[in-house]
């Protein structure tokens, strides 16, 4: 019997990505999100 | 395009302190962040703290947060790193970084110029 095993080749990594409100707006702060897998999630 | 020449770099005892500072020329310096990244030898070149175009945010690497201050004088075209309380792990080439609006600060591909570098060279 031939045996097969699911795997996607890669990792899918994840990187904090930080803005600054001030740079597309007045207001001050910053914002955090995430990117998982070159998309940016949160 | 804006040119960025640091200084400020050398070498000090654990414990001490440096000031860097980073001189812009060419385009309107209020129009860019800025950034501090640094790079030890065999690692990437690792974040280390942004600020905004009017100053009025920063944001720090955890590691250096509590140690270093980033601020900007626009008069002078000029941005500055505080750091104090310094490590033998801080030991790097730090380079100054102009970013445009709308980009992530904590990353270096968002930075599209770049000083040459000033070498931190911190011993225990």
């Known amino acids: 019997d031939a045996e097969f095993r699911h795997d996607s080749g890669y990792e899918v990594h994840h990187q904090k990505l930080v803005f600054f409100a001030e740079d597309v707006g007045s207001n001050k702060g910053a914002i955090i999100g995430l990117m998982v897998g070159g998309v940016v999630i949160a | 395009e804006v040119q960025l020449v640091e200084s400020g770099g050398g070498l000090v005892q654990a414990g001490g302190s440096l000031r860097l500072s980073c001189v812009a020329s060419?385009?309107?310096?209020?129009?860019?962040?800025m950034g501090w990244f640094r790079q030890a030898p065999g690692k990437d070149r690792e974040f280390v703290a942004a600020?905004?175009?009017?100053?009025?945010?920063?944001y720090y690497e955890d590691d250096v947060k509590g140690r270093f201050t980033i601020s900007r004088d626009n008069a002078k075209n000029s941005v500055y790193l505080q750091m104090n309380s310094l490590k033998p792990e801080d030991t790097a080439v730090y380079y100054c970084a102009a970013r445009p609006s709308y980009v992530a600060v904590n990353i270096a591909a968002s930075y599209n110029n770049w000083g040459q570098g000033t070498q931190v060279t911190v011993s225990s």
């Open positions: 600020i905004s175009r009017s100053g009025g945010t920063t």
């Open positions: 060419g385009r309107t310096f209020s129009n860019y962040g």
